[in-house]
Interface confidence: medium
């Protein structure tokens, strides 16, 4: 009885097809597989970026695999052949492991790339980010940024760019057409007269750095002598109803601070007879149900129902900004 | 609109130390990011440090381990500590503030080095 043995897939490669972190990892299917014709190999791809305490581990009869990493860092991985019990008499077997590691050669000192980077989703609809000049650069120094995500073709680089000092220090993204739910990718790297600039890579989904705009159209009902409902409407734009979380404050004469999170458009709050002025103010955030995380809107206009008697239906409506 | 003006600059000995301090119109609580830039003769101006709101700095290679940046939110100040001062130090240094997507740099103070 010989033992059985299978190599290693070859020519294990990852390849870095210009997406900004988006690499490929292939291989070919291992020498001497003749036999094993009647069987169908498998494969097990173990990957990470360095420095991660885990690999993702994939188990696969393909040839190729592809998956985001940060390019900030170095990336390795391995992968073995696998032959399932029914090709080897009943005990799968493992090939060695095939290895390769993947990094971009940085150019220039750590301090040089950008900091405190900002990404921001405009109520679902604009997209800007922004970010401070890197240490011990010159004001020569410029910034680039380019981006990509699935169903783009090749990277983009930023047309629009906000700049401070004659640098660039931000973009403004165009339309970006069914670009949520899946990995964004950008770069930022930088040119200067005198001393290269290191690349700064990240990543995120843009669902959730969205600021939606603020709640509109507050009003007031009077629904019993002791309850009054607040409603308001939700801003102009893409997002539906569905998404919204939202947070209210509301002050009795000017001394009770009352905050609630609802999520409906609609707040019932149990009044005194005594009260003599409501005002409330509300803001929106995207909530976990279109959304992993937010960022939340500014306030709402604040809203306020004045009178005598807040159980006789006067109502004064003062729009002016909450601070 | 952010006003900016540095002092403590002067003449000093290879080897000596200066404090500079760079004092601002309005309040600086809200404003995430400052820094010291400087430009030597007939050279660009370049960041040397920062320091956001949480207190966390960055030093440009050249001045790591020599200066040290601070700031006092209650007193409206950034500040920039220069030990061990070189004659390559010798620059018009300014002062740095970034709320937002502007940008604010005052009108700058003399450091000479120089036995």
């Known amino acids: 009885d010989t033992e059985i043995k299978v190599n290693p897939p070859q020519d294990f490669e990852i390849v870095d097809p210009g997406y900004l972190g988006y690499l490929y990892l292939q291989w070919q299917p291992p020498l001497s597989l003749d036999h094993f014709k009647e069987c169908t190999v498998e494969y097990e791809l173990k990957y990470r970026n360095i420095g991660s305490e885990t690999w993702k581990t994939i188990i696969t009869k393909n040839l190729h695999y592809k998956d985001g990493f940060d390019l900030n860092k170095g990336i390795e991985a391995k992968i073995h052949t696998l032959l399932p019990w029914q090709c080897t008499n009943g005990s799968e077997v493992q090939s060695s492991w095939a290895e390769t590691t993947y990094w971009i050669s940085p150019q220039g000192i750590p301090e040089t790339k950008v900091q405190d980077m900002d990404c921001v989703y405009y109520n679902w609809q604009y997209l800007l980010c922004s970010w401070k000049p890197g240490i011990g650069v010159l004001l020569d120094t410029n910034y680039n940024l380019f981006y990509w995500y699935e169903g783009l073709d090749h990277a983009l680089q930023c047309v629009d760019y906000i700049k401070a000092d004659g640098q660039n220090i931000g973009c403004r993204f165009p339309y970006l057409e069914a670009s949520d739910y899946k990995d964004f990718y950008i770069c930022v790297n930088g040119s200067s007269e005198n001393k290269p600039i290191r690349s700064s890579y990240f990543t995120f989904q843009l669902q959730n750095i969205v600021k939606p705009l603020p709640p509109v159209y507050l009003t007031f009902t009077r629904e019993s002598s002791c309850e009054i409902k607040l409603k308001w409407s939700i801003p102009l734009g893409p997002i539906p109803a569905r998404c919204f979380d939202y947070e209210i404050e509301i002050r009795e004469d000017d001394t009770t601070l009352v905050t609630a999170t609802v999520e409906n458009e609609t707040y019932t709050l149990k009044t005194t007879n005594e009260t003599r002025q409501l005002c409330f103010v509300v803001r929106s955030k995207v909530n976990i149900y279109c959304s992993d995380d937010g960022i939340w809107s500014e306030w709402s206009d604040k809203q306020c129902w004045e009178g005598e008697d807040l159980s006789k239906k006067t109502l004064l409506r003062h729009h002016h900004h909450h601070h | 609109q952010v006003q900016l003006q540095e002092s403590g600059g002067g003449l000093v000995q290879p080897g000596g130390s200066l404090r500079l301090s760079c004092t601002a119109s309005g309040s600086i609580r809200g404003i995430g990011y400052m820094a010291w830039g400087r430009q030597g003769p007939g050279k660009p101006r370049e960041l040397i440090a920062t320091?956001?709101?949480?207190?966390?700095?960055n030093y440009a290679e050249s001045v790591k381990g020599r200066f040290t940046v601070s700031r006092d939110n209650a007193e409206n100040t950034l500040y920039l500590q220069m030990n061990n001062l070189k004659s390559e130090d010798t620059a018009v240094y300014y002062c740095?503030?970034?709320?937002?997507?502007?940008?604010?740099w005052g009108q700058g103070t003399q450091v000479t080095v120089s036995s």
């Open positions: 320091i956001n709101s949480a207190g966390d700095t």
């Open positions: 740095n503030a970034r709320p937002g997507l502007q940008s604010y």
